[in-house]
């Protein structure tokens, strides 16, 4: 059929609750493209009728709710003027009652369901809620061992649960719950999270060194594509996170809809005394709004930024 297969994504999901998956793959989906969802190599596209339990909502496939029989491979076909790409999504639906048993026995749970708090620190858990804008999400409630979390040490901040002065007792099974409203109907979203406690310092006990960038500006023409590496050295046993942020937000979250600016996949080279990590940021198309904004590379407690600048006019051309 002339479509190029890009990748396979595996998702393990809970039955009886809403689920959505967004078909995005920059730079392919950043241009003028059409997106169509199919199930199990069917030639018939997923319905776009919003009353259907399973339907396509713009680039998303939306299950309201997910059911046991929905397991299978779904294809998202991205057609451009001269191209065709296909993403495969393998959905496995399981029956899960978070309060009945531990989620420890479930296979290959994603990192969204396994989170870490740092002993003695102020830290946070994240409730991962990925839905199209047609879905209105009610206030998030947090539970530990099936009891609603209350107390001075806890604050709900958007999709986060802030935990101050983390103690060993904070380990355990958590869940975040929200009511999703779509076309006048309400559905419950409940995400279970297994929380472990680490005694390591909040950022791995080491101070990573950012080799590049060095808090400087980069001259770049409007409309061009730009890739900037963040190079970091750190101890071999570190637990530091490395990422790019803008406006105090992960770039992948900040540009969640447009995908115009993305963080790359981290790579590292191992040396005898340390590791050298590289994580890049890709600007598919530099826009005016990007100039003058600090794009921050974070590595544990270390930060460094780049600021994009318009090149100075070349007066020799006149």
């Amino acid at each position: 059929d002339g479509c190029k297969d890009i990748f396979m994504k595996n998702e393990i999901l809970s039955a009886s609750q809403p689920f959505a998956f967004n078909c995005t793959f920059p730079p392919i989906t950043s241009g003028e493209v059409s997106v169509t969802w199919y199930k199990n190599s069917s030639k018939i596209p997923v319905s776009k009728i919003i009353q259907s339990r399973i339907h396509q909502d713009e680039t998303w496939i939306l299950f309201l709710p997910m059911e046991w029989g929905d397991s299978g491979v779904y294809q998202c076909v991205i057609k451009g003027r001269d191209s065709c790409h296909r993403i495969h999504v393998n959905l496995t639906v399981f029956e899960k009652h978070w309060c009945d048993t531990s989620i420890g026995g479930l296979p290959n749970l994603s990192d969204e369901y396994k989170q870490i708090l740092h002993l003695g620190k102020d830290d946070s858990l994240t409730c991962h809620l990925h839905f199209p804008k047609s879905c209105v999400l009610g206030p998030i409630k947090w539970y530990k061992d099936c009891n609603e979390i209350k107390g001075e040490r806890f604050t709900v901040l958007e999709t986060r649960l802030l935990v101050s002065n983390v103690s060993a007792e904070d380990r355990g099974n958590y869940a975040c719950q929200a009511i999703l409203t779509h076309s006048g109907k309400q559905y419950e979203v409940l995400n279970g999270i297994t929380v472990s406690i680490t005694e390591r310092a909040g950022y791995g006990g080491s101070v990573p060194k950012i080799i590049y960038p060095k808090n400087h500006s980069i001259e770049v023409q409007l409309g061009t594509t730009l890739i900037v590496d963040c190079n970091v050295t750190d101890t071999k046993d570190n637990t530091n996170l490395r990422c790019w942020r803008v406006n105090n937000t992960l770039v992948d979250d900040y540009y969640d809809e447009s995908k115009r600016i993305r963080e790359g996949v981290e790579t590292h080279v191992s040396f005898r005394e340390h590791n050298l990590y590289t994580v890049n940021i890709t600007f598919l198309e530099v826009k005016m709004e990007d100039y003058g904004l600090p794009f921050m590379c974070h590595a544990g407690v270390s930060t460094a930024y780049i600021i994009l600048q318009l090149p100075a006019p070349d007066f020799r051309a006149y």
């Epitope: 102020d122 946070s124 804008k133 209105v136 101050s164 105090n248 937000t249 447009s258």
Partner: antibody, heavy 117, light 107 residues
Framework: DVQFQESGPGLVKPSQTLSLTCTVT?????????WNWIRQPPGKGLEWIGY???????NYNPSLKSRVTITRDTSKNQFSLKLSSVTAADTATYFC??????????WGQGTLVTVSS | DIQMTQSPSSLSASVGDRVTITCRAS??????LNWYQQKPGKAPKLLIY???RLHSGVPSRFSPSGSGTDYTFTISSLQPEDIATYYC?????????FGGGTKVEIK
Amino acid sequence: DVQFQESGPGLVKPSQTLSLTCTVTGYSITSDFAWNWIRQPPGKGLEWIGYISYSGDTNYNPSLKSRVTITRDTSKNQFSLKLSSVTAADTATYFCAIRGPYSFTYWGQGTLVTVSS
Amino acid sequence: DIQMTQSPSSLSASVGDRVTITCRASQDINNYLNWYQQKPGKAPKLLIYYTSRLHSGVPSRFSPSGSGTDYTFTISSLQPEDIATYYCQQGHTLPWTFGGGTKVEIK
């Protein structure tokens, strides 16, 4: 819960420097997020002044940038605002607030600063 | 800077009425739109973040929608405790900016 308390003089003379401090309880300002100052002149709308992030980097509203400095004292879990060369137009209620990934999620109750000789 | 234009600047409605406030951005803000409620002499309180997510403790009569440059905020059944000024705010591009506010009063 994360809570805020703004403090500082309620009256500042024109051309002087306005200084305010925000004391945060319930969460360390070095753990995450951006810690902001926002102001509201009497009977008017809201204006974002700037922030200091958990890592210590700052960002200011260009309209005030030349006059604003935001610093922090991590030992006291406080961040501070200095606004130089004030005029009557700087008379406002000044709020401190935490910004999550999307919004100014929680605010202090605000402190009114009047610029007058 | 991104300009945020709110309308109307004030409105008067009866208890139980459906009330709608609109907010228009001068450029696409990609759903990075928040709504706040401010009562006289108090700090603003977050109601809705990222276009369609209700903050902790916010009742379901507050209903948001919108995308691109145009956003709306609806109170399905106005209650006496909803008397306040409502502000929209964009969190897409620095400097973060607010709408001029909509004052909601009871008839």
